[in-house]
């Protein structure tokens, strides 16, 4: 997974929204204790911004040491800074914790760019604005890192919420959420509402701002509008899903749907951008360029290098298209679509040199590791990671940024055939899965 602008085929699969509506499966499940309703103590427990990650306050050790921890659905280790680092305000001091237990084992996590390494142990962990429980969890105490911590991000560690298969050093290291569910009565589900500000935040504003909510063990109805639509988790490693169709302003990209998921498609709160496989990225940019051709943007804008600016308050949102991703539904031959606005994929950036203008960075980028639905996508939606039922739910977020003419949307059902063929089967090798 990546926090900055980080971290073989079949043809013609229809997937057209034929206007044909399938009989509606009840996507609202019957009430279950602990799974539904209000989670007031957890609402607004995230801070941060899409460019540098969203973090939750956690405590580790006895007496408790408070740290801000990046919420990352694209990895599976709970890892915290445990030694001085120029970008850290504070770090976990194991020697001060009476409940720390050393596992006498090291861990090394390389990324394509950068790495972190540390020492494994366990300690007592709780989330002050989360469920009222304390769990003994595995902790990687980071002693050395490169291109991992971000200057000014205000977080000191990472909470990997994905599955054990991608945990380091191997899948025997139980991830935090597994420990939480095993040791408590917290249901095996969490949900995320990431709230993009829609305008740039300076450091003091970020510290004061609300970034969203991580609801542990349930779903809070106040955080979304409309219905929740669910897509199956294809395989429990990353939160892998299957995209069956992509549209730009309603125009199908008309690619073999395997391309959209080459070599996988994941939902990753630890990545800033919507990242697309090379061929898909090129087709999407071509289509977005064509739709917004009333203005000529520099090549560097599409690369994420150049900002584009407009006089304050005059951003021409209407010239930019909406982007729809169709996801495999829970019912055979049924899909649904999630639609994001330019308010999600143009990321506001503050630059003193151009402070009189509203400036933006293009937050869709190329990937060599498949589609990554990062904060750009997640900021439009309330996303339910229903691990118990092996599915991910999407509903329109109550905090998404939009204008008077268009809003993000989650709509369905649509008839889509042969969706299973859209998944790419990664050849099994011994290669690291985390080398993203």
């Amino acid at each position: 997974t990546q926090h900055g602008i980080r971290l073989p085929l079949r043809s013609g699969l229809g997937g057209a929204p034929l206007g044909l509506r399938l009989p509606r499966e009840t996507d609202e499940e019957p009430e279950e204790p602990g799974r539904r309703g209000s989670f007031v103590e957890m609402v607004d427990n995230l801070r941060g911004k899409s460019g540098q990650g969203y973090y939750v306050e956690m405590t580790v050790g006895s007496p408790p040491q408070t740290l801000n921890i990046l919420v990352d659905t694209g990895s599976s280790n709970f890892a915290v800074g445990a030694a001085p680092h120029p970008f850290l305000h504070r770090y976990y001091q194991r020697q001060l914790s009476s409940t720390y237990r050393d596992l006498r084992k090291g861990v090394y996590v390389p990324y394509t760019q950068g790495k972190w390494e540390g020492e494994l142990g366990t300690d007592l962990v709780s989330i002050p604005h989360g469920p009222n429980v304390t769990v003994r969890a595995n902790i990687a105490a980071i002693t050395e890192s490169d291109k991992f911590f971000i200057n000014g991000s205000n977080w000191e560690g990472i909470l990997g919420l994905a599955y054990a298969e991608i945990a380091r050093p191997d899948d025997s290291l139980e991830p935090f959420f597994d420990s939480l569910v095993k040791q408590t009565h917290v249901p095996n589900l969490f949900s995320l509402q990431l709230c993009g500000a829609g305008f740039p935040l300076n450091q003091s504003e970020v510290l004061a701002s609300v970034g969203g909510s991580m609801i542990i063990g349930g779903i809070d109805h106040s955080l979304y509008t409309g219905s929740l639509w669910y897509t199956p988790i294809r395989r429990e490693w990353y939160y892998e899903v299957i995209i069956v169709r992509v549209e730009i302003n309603g125009q199908d990209l008309k690619m073999d749907c395997k391309e959209y998921n080459y070599d996988k498609s994941i939902v990753d709160s630890g990545t800033t951008n919507l990242r697309l496989p090379k061929k898909v990225f090129e087709a999407a940019v071509k289509s977005i360029k064509a739709a917004s051709s009333t203005e000529k943007f520099p090549d560097g804008f599409w690369l994420g290098e150049q900002l584009v600016c407009w006089q304050a308050g005059t951003t021409p949102w209407n010239i930019f298209p909406v982007i729809s991703l169709y996801l495999m539904g829970e019912v055979t031959n049924q899909s649904f679509r999630i639609t994001i606005l330019p308010q999600q994929y143009l990321r506001p950036v503050e630059d003193v040199a151009t402070s009189q203008d509203d400036c933006y960075k293009f937050a869709i980028s190329q990937s060599s590791t498949g589609t990554v639905m990062g904060a750009v996508i997640m900021e439009g939606f309330y996303v339910v990671f229903d691990r118990a039922r092996k599915r991910i739910g999407f509903a329109v977020s109550a905090c998404h940024v939009h204008d008077e003419f268009r809003t993000a949307a989650v709509e369905g059902p649509f008839v889509t055939l042969d969706m299973e063929d859209c998944g790419y089967n990664i050849p099994q090798t011994d290669e690291s899965t985390l080398m993203t």
Partner: antibody
Framework: EVQLQQSGAELVRPGTSVKLSCKAS????????MHWVKQRPGQGLEWIGM????????KNNQKFKGKATLTVDTSSSTAYMQLISLTSEDSAVYYC?????????WGQGTLVTVSA | DILMTQSQKFMSTSVGDRVSVTCKAS??????VAWYQQISGQSPKPLIY???HRYSGVPDRFTGSGSGTDFTLTISNVQSEDLVEFFC?????????FGGGTKLEIK
């Protein structure tokens, strides 16, 4: 306040190499590409290339391929440019400049003099 | 590569005058042009981006205009500190290219 502090002047022999540095402060280093620009005495400006500190992605001017190598060290928020096989044609002031809209921030420049 | 041509290497003007420095691109660059001012021995100072937007802190006597291939930097009420060199730059496509520069001199 955004600042780009470049290393001091260099007097180097033909055929050798030199590594220039540009230390950034006042912004999140990973968020912006860093560019390098050449200016020969009394002449115009030439764009050498740029690097994305978040993932080391590089875009070079073909003219400087094999001459300039761009790198970064994110832990010290520093960009580097190494120039190899130096000749008198490489005698110039070299600037680092940060992305934004065009190039809104420039370092003070490093004078490289290639002389036997 | 896109060629940026500043046809006048030197321009004569007087303090208080209005002067226009021109720049021509060899192909359409939209409005993706910047202007820089350079005092001898110093680094370029950004003045204008997106053809006509002033960077923060740039005096309003500097005005940029143009789109496509023809661009102009106009300095009204020229001050003595403006008698330096001005460069245009296109950032529409890679490699980024600069004009050869225009030096303002006293008449």
């Amino acid at each position: 306040e955004v600042q780009l502090q470049q290393s001091g002047a260099e007097l180097v022999r033909p055929g050798t190499s030199v590594k220039l540095s540009c230390k950034a402060s006042g912004y999140t280093f990973n968020n912006y590409w860093m560019h390098w620009v050449k200016q020969r005495p009394g002449q115009g400006l030439e764009w050498i290339g740029m690097i994305d500190p978040s993932d080391d992605d590089i875009k070079n001017n073909q003219k400087f391929k094999g001459k300039a190598t761009l790198t970064v060290d994110t832990s010290s928020s520093t960009a580097y440019m190494q120039l190899i096989s130096l000749t008198s044609e490489d005698s110039a002031v070299y600037y680092c400049a940060r992305s934004g809209v065009a190039l809104p921030y420039w370092g003070q420049g490093t004078l490289v003099t290639v002389s036997a | 590569d896109i060629l940026m041509t500043q046809s006048q290497k030197f321009m004569s003007t007087s303090v208080g005058d209005r002067v226009s420095v021109t720049c021509k691109a060899s192909q359409n660059v939209g409005r993706n042009v910047a202007w820089y001012q350079q005092i001898s021995g110093q680094s370029p100072k950004p003045l204008i981006y997106s053809a006509s937007h002033r960077y923060s802190g740039v005096p309003d006597r500097f005005t940029g205009s143009g789109s496509g291939t023809d661009f102009t930097l106009t300095i009204s009420n020229v001050q003595s500190e403006d008698l330096v060199e001005f460069f245009c730059q296109q950032y529409n496509s890679y490699p980024y290219t600069f004009g050869g520069g225009t030096k303002l001199e006293i008449k």
